[in-house]
């Protein structure tokens, strides 16, 4: 018998230092590019190998980025969000939301799944 899939949502502050090739990740989302139904938030779609984000190790594909250097990412056009990152300076503080998939097995058993992407 299969259990239902639930998600454990956690928030984290991640401080990245811009590397020679930048921050090293891609994003999707925005009011004109909804990646998740009824959510115009900004999500990480790719972590580039050997980039600043990959070397730091905390930011994951599928994470939702809530703010950049304290600036809220709600209700932004996609390109405006991209520009915000590009103009964020050398030291960049990201407030991110991780969603961890938790598999609820049959009664009496609780197993943890892999992070969702």
């Amino acid at each position: 018998m299969n259990g239902r899939v639930d998600y454990l949502v956690t928030e984290e502050e991640i401080n990245l230092t811009r590397g020679p090739s930048g921050l090293g990740f891609n994003i999707v989302g925005g009011t004109d590019q909804q990646y998740v139904s009824n959510d115009s938030g900004i999500y990480v779609s790719r972590i580039k190998e050997n980039g600043a984000a990959a070397l730091d190790g905390r930011l994951q594909e599928g994470d939702k980025i809530l703010s950049v250097n304290g600036q809220d990412l709600k209700n932004l056009l996609h390109q405006d969000a991209v520009d915000l990152f590009r103009n964020a300076g050398y030291a960049v503080s990201l407030r991110v939301q991780h969603r961890l998939q938790v598999q609820n097995g049959p009664i009496g058993h609780r197993g943890e799944g892999d992070p969702s992407g």
């Epitope: 090739s21 930048g22 921050l23 090293g24 990740f25 891609n26 994003i27 999707v28 004109d32 590019q33 990646y35 999500y43 990480v44 779609s45 790719r46 580039k48 996609h78 390109q79 991209v82 990152f85 590009r86």
Partner: nanobody, 127 residues
Framework: EVQLVESGGGLVQAGGSLRLSCAAS????????MAWFRQAPGKEREFVAA????????YYADSVKGRFTISRDNAKNTVYLQMNSLKPEDTAVYVC?????????????????????WGQGTQVTVS
């Protein structure tokens, strides 16, 4: 996992035209940045053209400017390369590339490292 399948290649005479298609899997195609590269025998992979997620920005190699046009149909999950005034030096395997989302760093459309999904390619021969 994104899958890219190219079609439309073939043998054409110099001065002729071809239209290549690249069909992509995935429900979020409208977030993909897409590009065409080509590789001739014994040569390095060469950037041809790129298009952003919405189709509002396009980029071309100098060697194809004014002759090739890249476009996309997000409803059909497909990107196109219209190739006119073909020359023998356009002979190559044409490969479609994609990445989900926009880089937060400087965008270098001609850099293969910008893309992490690649098709198998379609052969174009201009005689």
């Amino acid at each position: 996992e994104v899958q890219l399948v190219e079609s439309g290649g073939g043998l054409v005479q110099a001065g002729g035209s071809l239209r290549l298609s690249c069909a992509a899997s995935g429900r979020t195609f409208s977030t993909y940045e897409m590009a065409w590269f080509r590789q001739a025998p014994g040569k390095e992979r060469e950037f041809v053209a790129a298009i952003n997620w919405s189709g509002s920005s396009t980029y071309y190699a100098d060697s194809v400017k004014g002759r090739f046009t890249i476009s996309r149909d997000n409803a059909k999950n497909t990107v196109y390369l219209q190739m006119n005034s073909l020359k023998p030096e356009d002979t190559a395997v044409y490969v479609c590339a994609a990445v989900i989302g926009s880089t937060v760093d400087e965008y270098r459309p001609s850099d293969p490292l910008e893309y992490n999904y690649w098709g198998q390619g379609t052969q174009v021969t201009v005689s």
